[in-house]
C-alpha cells in the first residue's frame, strides 16, 4: 500500500522535469489519484476517467488512462487511482507473447486430439492427443474435427494496473 512511484521509475517519455532530492522517502509525495504541482508544494487531483496514479508519487503529471481497443471489452473503467481494465471479447484471446492484440480462438481440435480447455480471454482452446495426452502446439490445424469450444468464461483482465 505504501509503495511509491518517483520520476525515475517512469519510462523516459513519461518523465517530467527533474525534481529536487527529497530528504525522506515520503516527503513531498502525493497520494494515489494525485500528482505534484510544479513548485512541489501542492497535490493536484488526476482527472476522473482521463488519467490516474496508482501509488504515492512525485509525478508532475498523472498517467493517461488506457482506452480499450476494438475487439476488447471494458471490464472496469479508469478511475483516478486505477487504470482501465480491458479484456478480449468472447471467442478471442490474448497471448503473453503477443499482448498487443486479441486473436481468434480456434473452433475445434485437429483429428486425433480432444479438447481439454475452453477458449478464455487469455488462452486459446487446449487440445491433447487422445492416446498420449500430450498438448498440441497451438498451430491452427489443417483439418479440424467438429469439436467446438464453448464461449469464453469471464475472467482475469488483460490490462492490469499496479
Amino acid at each position: 500500500e505504501s509503495a511509491l512511484i518517483t520520476q525515475q521509475d517512469l519510462a523516459p517519455q513519461q518523465r517530467a522535469a527533474p525534481q529536487q532530492k527529497r530528504s525522506s522517502p515520503s516527503e513531498g509525495l502525493c497520494p494515489p489519484g494525485h500528482h505534484i504541482s510544479e513548485d512541489g508544494r501542492d497535490c493536484i487531483s488526476c482527472k476522473y476517467g482521463q488519467d490516474y496514479s496508482t501509488h504515492w508519487n512525485d509525478l508532475l503529471f498523472c498517467l493517461r488512462c488506457t482506452r480499450c481497443d476494438s475487439g476488447e471489452v471494458e471490464l472496469s473503467p479508469c478511475t483516478t487511482t486505477r487504470n482501465t481494465v480491458c479484456q478480449c471479447e468472447e471467442g478471442t484471446f490474448r497471448e503473453e507473447d503477443s499482448p498487443e492484440m486479441c486473436r481468434k480462438c480456434r473452433t475445434g481440435c485437429p483429428r486425433g486430439m480432444v479438447k481439454v480447455g475452453d477458449c478464455t480471454p487469455w488462452s486459446d482452446i487446449e487440445c491433447v492427443h487422445k492416446e498420449s495426452g500430450t498438448k498440441h502446439s497451438g498451430e491452427v490445424p489443417a483439418v479440424e474435427e467438429t469439436v467446438t469450444s464453448s464461449p469464453g468464461t469471464p475472467a482475469s483482465p488483460c490490462s492490469l494496473s499496479g
Epitope: 522517502p25 515520503s26 504541482s37 504515492w56
Partner: antibody
Framework: QVQLVQSGAEVKKPGASVKVSCKAS????????LHWVRQAPGQGLEWMGW????????KYNEKFKDRVTITADKSTSTVYMELSSLRSEDTAVYYC????????????WGQGTLVTVSS | DIQMTQSPSFLSASVGDRVTITCRAS??????VAWYQQKPGKAPKLLIY???TRHTGVPDRFSGSGSGTDFTLTISSLQPEDIATYYC?????????FGGGTKLEIK
C-alpha cells in the same frame, strides 16, 4: 464499524499549545489518510493537514505550517494534532476525518474536540 | 488557494420543495467537488463526491451536478430531516477548501 474517537474539550490561554488525539478503529489504520479540519464558532470548515500511517507522509496547509504538528502512534492507531502559539481566533471545533488513498473527500469524521482559547 | 463561494448562505423552504444550492470555484476544479451535510453540534457527513456520485447510504433525493467552476446540490423533495447546513468542498488541489455553507430551514 469505522470509528474516529477524539479527546475531550480543552481550555487554553493565548500563547499556549494544545494536543488533540484521534483514535481510529474498525478499519486498517495504514490504508487511509487521516486529516485535521477545524471549524470556528458559526464559521465554515478549514483543512489543516494530513498524516498517512502507511508511509508517514505528512502534509500541512501552508496557513498552519509554522504552528501545527501532526504525529501518530501506530501501535494504538492514534493520530495527534498539536497547535502552538494559540490565539483567540484558534477557538474552534477540531475534527479528525479520514479519506481513502484517492480523491480528497472525507468519508468518516470524528465527533470533534472544542478548543477554547481565552485569557 | 481556491475559493469556494456558496449561495445562498441561508435558505428557507417547505417540505416537498425542490431545493438547489450552488457553489462556484475561483478556478477550474474539473469535477473534484464534494458536498457535506452538517447538523448542529455534529460532524459533517459526506453526501456527494466527484460532483455527482452519491456516497453509500445517501437518499436518492440528493443529487449533484457540475464541472469546471459551477456546481449544484439539489434536494428533489425536501424532508424535515434535511434541515442542516450544507458545505461544498473542492478536492482538486491542496489546500482543500470549503464553501462558507448554506443553512437550510423549514418554512
Amino acid at each position: 464499524q469505522v470509528q474516529l474517537v477524539q479527546s475531550g474539550a480543552e481550555v487554553k490561554k493565548p500563547g499556549a499549545s494544545v494536543k488533540v488525539s484521534c483514535k481510529a478503529s474498525g478499519y486498517t489504520f495504514t490504508e487511509y489518510i487521516l486529516h485535521w479540519v477545524r471549524q470556528a464558532p458559526g464559521q465554515g470548515l478549514e483543512w489543516m493537514g494530513w498524516f498517512y500511517p502507511g508511509n508517514n507522509n505528512i502534509k500541512y496547509n501552508e496557513k498552519f505550517k509554522d504552528r501545527v504538528t501532526i504525529t501518530a502512534d501506530k501501535s494504538t492507531s492514534t493520530v495527534y494534532m498539536e497547535l502552538s502559539s494559540l490565539r483567540s481566533e484558534d477557538t474552534a471545533v477540531y475534527y479528525c476525518a479520514r479519506h481513502e488513498q484517492g480523491p480528497g473527500y472525507f468519508d468518516y469524521w470524528g465527533q470533534g474536540t472544542l478548543v477554547t482559547v481565552s485569557s | 488557494d481556491i475559493q469556494m463561494t456558496q449561495s445562498p448562505s441561508f435558505l428557507s423552504a417547505s417540505v416537498g420543495d425542490r431545493v438547489t444550492i450552488t457553489c462556484r470555484a475561483s478556478q477550474d476544479v474539473n469535477t473534484a467537488v464534494a458536498w457535506y451535510q452538517q447538523k448542529p453540534g455534529k460532524a459533517p457527513k459526506l453526501l456527494i463526491y466527484w460532483a455527482s456520485t452519491r456516497h453509500t447510504g445517501v437518499p436518492d433525493r440528493f443529487s449533484g451536478s457540475g464541472s469546471g467552476t459551477d456546481f449544484t446540490l439539489t434536494i428533489s423533495s425536501l424532508q424535515p430531516e434535511d434541515i442542516a447546513t450544507y458545505y461544498c468542498q473542492q478536492h482538486y488541489i491542496t489546500p482543500w477548501t470549503f464553501g462558507g455553507g448554506t443553512k437550510l430551514e423549514i418554512k
